[in-house]
């Protein structure tokens, strides 16, 4: 008994395709070893047609593939364009010849079925319309016209001239004649079902003078789409249903035992599992739509099936398009945490990843919202202003060339939780979904600046502390000048060499800023936080006013912000650091400048891809002027 | 509501033939896939046949221990499908089980590969 299985009787009809399933034991050998599709010659011989090891004889040639999944220990051999010299005995098997493990298959391609000479044949899709043209001669322009569909006995009238209309075809079936045409008249049958596939006759006038024609009606159901996907990257389901449903509520739905579970329509229905990953998208008039997922699950694969009804629901009848979608395990996506925890007023920093082969590319954050059809308006981007509500909060740093950049945000609110997308103008199979959660803060922040209302006086020096625990003793301490293209790190130097120290005092770890002399360009945010490598990790925000010396003058706090600016107890682990390069302004900051919106997310590669450094940096900071002392007591 | 239902099954003599069939009702779409599994008492449920419908090829499978004594049949469009069974003998005793689908993804072989399931009609050899 051969440990290979699969179809054993195989039928076609010419100018069709098959696709042969071959199942194969579940072992590393198998999973890495040569399939091949071989047809046996009478003298037991069998003779390579297509193998895994990229082979394809002449008469396969531009016709036939042979993919293997081995996530699903199949391979499958897609075979169009038959004809009946296909027919024959073949074998589907695995191992370096053709005389390893193998199972026989017999493939039988028929001639498309004979009908009626003047049989006009019509293939239509599940759901679609079909109009029949029906000619007849003059002298049967008074006579009754009339369709009827042949069962085993009879034929079943469908329409007439006489407005009779059989039961199942009410409201579907219209017989019409065309302006002064008087030699032809039309049945149109909408929302095709199985039921209606068949023979049909056209007649008019009645007895052996009549006008008849053999129709054959073909109602196909659309053949799935098959989409291989890996494990947390995102999928695009691109819906094309037709002008006729253009005006019609749109799904995707998902087969289930004994209905398809909609995902998501556009009447503001979601199902919670894509809660955070989902978003359906009108493209155009022309009925079409798409539906993106991200962050794929293994749980997310199966059969998903897209269509259009007043109900927003699968209707019979109803134009569909389905695929089958499955997740490959083996994911050349990282594995990161899919919830990151923060707290109030605290800070977490996000680890995106992007495919390492387009470190060029633009990256974006964004802040997934459900509401109406599901949308992402872009907050930060690599060449995209922050949003104006996270000014001084929010900040993007790329590190081209190793996979990942990281967001961070901080001054944290309960408001900030949610879901929040990385994605890129790139490979958009590297969209991932992060779900931020924010719990009211129960203990003092990590990171501490002083003094809190900080207003430093032109020309002066100021100095600014930031406070933090021994647990990020050996970590490096930064300070960095925020401005809506991101955060540019201070340059730094320590006041003398580390020494190794056995006890840490809690009390007296600082790094401290200082502006010397302060300048106007010094007023705005700046941010404490500790990083190691590329590792971001906490963050701590404070606004400093920049104001002229006035007699008796007394520092007014410019915001209450700074009194927030207080640090998440976890942080996200990341690999990435700062681009120091200073960024020029960008005038026309895309791919979301207008709305700042992911509305078209498929249709990514059109955008304006603006010039300029990724990595933020303020043209304005003066660093000479900007000394960054670590002082350790 | 989805129903498969089974018929034919019957006592019969070793090396005669049976027909079963299996009509499935309630559904809105055609199915793609439709098999029979049998149980003979105290074992697991096994394979029998299947056949697979795609646009208008057809896919029959069938376990070593049938090939060439059953066969398979259907239409997909009326959602119905035989079992033509030949040269029966004591071993091919049980419960004959109607599975079906509506698309053709997974091992044919595994009973989690269909969604619908019949009652099962029982087919009794006799020496």
């Known amino acids: 008994k051969s440990p290979i299985f699969g179809p054993q009787e195989v039928s076609s009809i010419e100018g069709d395709s098959v696709s042969i399933t071959c199942y194969y034991p579940d072992t590393s050998v198998n999973r890495h070893t040569r399939k091949y599709w071989c047809r046996q010659g009478a003298s037991g011989m069998c003779t390579t047609l297509i193998s895994s090891n990229g082979y394809l004889s002449k008469e396969y040639s531009g016709r036939a593939n042979l993919i293997n999944f081995p996530e699903n220990n199949t391979f499958v051999i897609n075979i169009e364009q038959l004809t009946q010299d296909d027919t024959g005995s073949y074998k589907c098997g695995l191992g370096t010849s053709n005389r390893g493990l193998s199972f026989d298959v017999s493939l039988e391609v028929s001639q498309v079925p004979e009908l009626p000479s003047d049989t006009h044949v019509y293939t239509k899709d599940i759901g679609r319309n079909v109009t029949i043209e029906c000619p007849f001669k003059r002298e049967n322009a008074p006579s009754k016209k009339s369709l009827c569909k042949k069962t085993n006995q009879s034929c079943e009238l469908v329409i007439d001239s006489t407005e009779k209309v059989n039961p199942s075809y009410i409201g579907r079936a219209k017989l019409f004649m065309k302006g002064t045409d008087l030699t032809v008249f039309y049945v149109n049958i909408s929302h095709l079902t199985h039921n209606d596939a068949g023979l049909y006759i056209c007649q008019a006038g009645e007895g052996p003078s009549a006008d008849k024609k053999n129709v054959d009606l073909q109602v196909l159901a659309p053949e799935p789409e098959l989409l291989y996907k890996d494990l947390r990257s995102s999928v695009t389901f691109e819906c094309d249903l037709g002008r006729e449903v253009a005006n019609e509520a749109k799904y995707l739905c998902r087969m289930n035992k004994e209905t398809c579970d909609v995902i998501i329509n556009t009447l503001g229905k979601r199902d919670p599992d894509f809660e955070g990953r989902i978003l359906i998208t009108p493209k155009d008039d022309n009925g079409r739509f798409s539906v993106l997922i991200t962050g794929l699950r293994k749980e997310d694969a199966g059969h998903y099936q897209c269509g259009a009804h007043s109900s927003g629901l699968p209707q019979e009848g109803w134009p569909i398009q389905t695929w089958q979608l499955f997740v490959n395990e083996e994911s050349t996506i990282p594995n990161r945490r899919s919830v990151v925890k923060g707290v109030t007023g605290g800070s977490v920093a996000i680890a995106c990843p992007y495919n390492p082969k387009e470190s060029s590319s633009l990256k974006y954050w964004c802040r997934w919202e459900g509401d109406g059809n599901g949308h992402c308006p872009v907050l930060v981007g690599t060449q995209a202003q922050v949003q104006e509500e996270y000014e001084g909060r929010l900040a993007l740093f790329d590190q081209p060339g190793n996979g990942t950049y990281t967001v961070i945000l901080n001054q944290l609110t309960t408001e900030d939780a949610g879901f929040y997308w990385c994605l890129t103008n790139g490979d958009s199979r590297w969209r991932t979904t992060i779900e931020l959660q924010v719990a009211e803060a129960t203990r003092e922040p990590n990171l501490e600046v002083t003094p809190q209302n900080a207003t430093a006086v032109l020309g002066e020096t100021f100095t600014v502390s930031c406070h933090y625990p021994c647990k990020f003793y050996s970590q490096e301490k930064y300070w960095c000048k925020w401005s809506n293209k991101g955060c540019h790190i201070l340059p730094s130097h320590d006041e003398g060499a580390r020494q190794s120290s056995v006890s840490c005092d809690q009390s007296s770890q600082l790094v401290s800023m200082t502006l010397n002399p302060v300048s106007k360009e010094d007023e705005g945010w700046y941010w404490c936080g500790v990083k190691q490598g590329q590792t971001y990790g906490e963050t701590t925000a404070i606004y400093i006013a920049v104001e002229e010396r006035t007699r008796g003058s007394s520092h007014v706090n410019p915001t209450d912000a700074n009194a927030r600016a207080k640090v998440a107890l976890e942080e996200e682990v990341v690999d990435s650091s700062i681009s120091e390069k200073e960024n020029k302004a960008i005038p026309n900051p895309g791919p979301f400048a207008n709305e700042r919106e992911i509305q078209n997310v498929g249709d990514q590669a059109q955008e304006n891809r603006a010039s300029g450094d990724a990595g933020s940096a303020d043209g304005q900071s003066r660093s000479s002027s900007s000394k960054h002392h670590h002082h350790h007591h | 509501e989805v129903q498969l239902v089974e018929s034919g099954g019957g006592v019969v003599q070793a090396e005669d033939s049976l027909r079963l069939s299996c009509a499935a009702s309630?559904?809105?779409?055609?199915?793609?896939?439709m098999g029979w599994f049998r149980q003979a008492p105290g074992k697991e449920r096994e394979f029998v046949a299947t056949?697979?419908?795609?646009?208008?090829?057809?896919?029959?499978y069938y376990d070593d221990s049938v090939k060439g004594r059953f066969a398979v049949s259907g239409d997909n469009t009326k959602n119905t499908m035989n079992l033509q069974m030949k040269g029966l003998n004591l071993e091919d005793t049980g419960v004959y089980y109607c599975?079906?689908?509506?698309?053709?993804?997974?091992?044919?072989?595994?009973?989690?590969?269909?969604?619908?399931w019949g009652q099962g009609t029982q087919v009794t050899v006799s020496s």
């Open positions: 309630g559904l809105s779409f055609s199915l793609s896939r």
């Open positions: 056949i697979e419908w795609s646009g208008r090829s057809t896919y029959k």
């Open positions: 599975a079906a689908n509506p698309n053709n993804y997974g091992d044919p072989r595994t009973p989690g590969a269909y969604q619908y």
